[in-house]
Interface confidence: low
């Protein structure tokens, strides 16, 4: 009974197509597969950024796989051939591992790369990124931003930079068609006559960095002698009502401060007959049903009632 063996895949490599972190892992079938012509060979692929504690594991019949990585760090991957038990009349047979690595050789010291990179997708419509120059870089240093997401043919450079003292410190993006709910890759690199500049890579999903506009049209309505309903409207724009959470801040007679988080555009407040003044503000954020994270909007304009019986008046602004 000869032991069945299989070779690892050939020509295993990580290919960088220039998409700023979205890499191709590809390989060729192992040598000497003639004995297993009737067999569908599978491959077990493991990969990770160097320094990560866990490997991502994929089992595939294909000869390639694509995923996103953090190019600030190196990447390591390994793959072996799997012969299912149906092919071997017994247990599954695995080859030895083929291994490969990939990294972008860092240029310049870490202090030269951009600091405090901050990207906000305003009202799910306009993406703006800003940064600070690296420590001690001279005014001849300039930074350039490139971006890519699935759907673009190649990485694009920012065409509308925000400048300070002649240096690029931010980018206003054009309309980004079909760009949410997928990884969005950014590279900020730089050039200087004096010294090399370290590149920085960033990956996020646009729906997770949305800062909505604040709610509008705040109103009061007396529901009963001890209840007041606060209402507001969602801001204009592409974000549907079902995607909002709200935070309300209510002040009664300049003493009591109530804060509450709610999911719809109303809030009922218990009051006493002695209430002489009532003010409230609201802000909005994209909720967990539409994103994994988000940024609170600015507070709305303050709406106040003062000195008149609330049962006789509804305020609208």
């Amino acid at each position: 009974d000869t032991e069945i063996k299989v070779n690892p895949p050939q020509d295993f490599e990580i290919v960088d197509p220039g998409y700023l972190g979205y890499l191709y892992l590809q390989w060729q079938p192992p040598l000497s597969l003639d004995h297993f012509k009737e067999c569908t060979v599978e491959y077990e692929l493991k990969y990770r950024n160097i320094g990560s504690e866990t490997w991502k594991t994929i089992i595939t019949k294909n000869l390639h796989y694509k995923d996103g990585f953090d190019l600030n760090k190196g990447i390591e991957a390994k793959i072996h051939t799997l012969l299912p038990w149906q092919c071997t009349n017994g247990s599954e047979v695995q080859s030895s591992w083929a291994e490969t690595t990939y990294w972008i050789s860092p240029q310049g010291i870490p202090e030269t790369k951009v600091q405090d990179m901050d990207c906000v997708y305003y009202n799910w419509q306009y993406l703006l990124c800003s940064w600070k120059p690296g420590i001690g870089v001279l005014l001849d240093t300039n930074y350039n931003l490139f971006y890519w997401y699935e759907g673009l043919d190649h990485a694009l450079q920012c065409v509308d930079y925000i400048k300070a003292d002649g240096q690029n410190i931010g980018c206003r993006f054009p309309y980004l068609e079909a760009s949410d709910y997928k990884d969005f890759y950014i590279c900020v690199n730089g050039s200087s006559e004096n010294k090399p500049i370290r590149s920085s890579y960033f990956t996020f999903q646009l729906q997770n960095i949305v800062k909505p506009l604040p709610p509008v049209y705040l109103t009061f309505t007396r529901e009963s002698s001890c209840e007041i309903k606060l209402k507001w409207s969602i801001p204009l724009g592409p974000i549907p009502a079902r995607c909002f959470d709200y935070e309300i801040e209510i002040r009664e007679d300049d003493t009591t401060l109530v804060t509450a988080t709610v999911e719809n555009e109303t809030y009922t407040l218990k009051t006493t007959n002695e209430t002489r003044q009532l003010c409230f503000v609201v802000r909005s954020k994209v909720n967990i049903y539409c994103s994994d994270d988000g940024i609170w909007s600015e507070w709305s304009d303050k709406q106040c009632w003062e000195g008149e019986d609330l049962s006789k008046k509804t305020l609208l602004r």
């Epitope: 160097i50 010291i109 870490p110 202090e111 420590i135 001690g136 010294k195």
Partner: antibody
């Protein structure tokens, strides 16, 4: 928030070794270096060396080069500093301190571990 | 090794005063257009706290009354208006080259 928690105080005999640990949390451990600094009672600060939590690369102060070993365990986000052939003048508080690039300074420090060398 | 000399070694001042501490390096600590000089505050029984990095950049959450200046070999830490919690020991530290070194410290005491 960033936290560096060090192991407890040690009393050791001259000629022996001591191994101090520093467990990090609240940040991406492998993006930073960990420095070790000591302070003898009533004295100033002395830099012992540092280790890159990403690659394990070390830079030691020549004064300690033959006696110090720094190691990292990325699975537990812990850095270790072992000092051997201890003598009474090694009695000090030993601190771990996080650093990024050289110019960023050591921005977060452990609470310190008092090592007393006494026969 | 780069030697850092701090002066004065002790300083008596009152709340509201302006305090200035200097640090002189035995050779330039500048490189890549950056001054690799940091300032720390330490209170008894506590670890040092980073106040200033890269000669003049403030550490996170530090009060604006702390400022740093200088380049090359001469550096200054200034506290514009002393508060009761500022009375402590201050150290300068260079990180241009290994071994990183500290100044001898300046003890700031209430007059």
């Amino acid at each position: 928030q960033v936290q560096l928690v060090q192991s407890g105080a040690e009393v050791v005999k001259p000629g022996a070794s001591v191994k101090v640990s520093c467990k990090a949390s609240g940040y991406t451990f492998t993006n930073y270096w960990m420095n070790w600094v000591r302070q003898a009672p009533g004295q100033g600060l002395e830099w012992i060396g540092r280790i890159d939590a990403y690659a394990g690369e070390t830079h030691y102060n020549q004064k300690f080069k033959d006696r110090v070993t720094m190691t990292v365990d990325t699975s537990t986000s812990t850095v270790y500093m072992e000092l051997s052939s201890l003598r009474s003048e090694d009695t000090a508080v030993y601190y771990c301190a996080r650093g990024y690039g050289d110019a960023y300074g050591m921005d977060h420090w452990g609470q310190g571990t008092l090592v007393t060398v006494s026969s | 090794d780069i030697v850092l000399t701090q002066s004065p070694s002790s300083l008596s001042a009152s709340v509201g005063d302006r305090a200035t501490i200097t640090c002189r390096a035995s050779e330039s600590v500048d490189n890549y257009g950056i001054s690799f000089m940091n300032w720390f505050q330490q209170k008894p029984g506590k670890p040092p706290k980073l106040l200033i990095y890269a000669a003049s950049r403030q550490g996170s959450g530090d009060p604006a009354r702390f400022s740093g200046s200088g380049s090359g070999t001469d550096f200054t830490l200034t506290i514009s208006s002393l508060q009761p919690e500022d009375f402590a020991t201050y150290f300068c530290q260079q990180s241009k080259e290994v071994p990183w070194t500290f100044g001898g410290g300046t003890k700031l005491e209430i007059k």
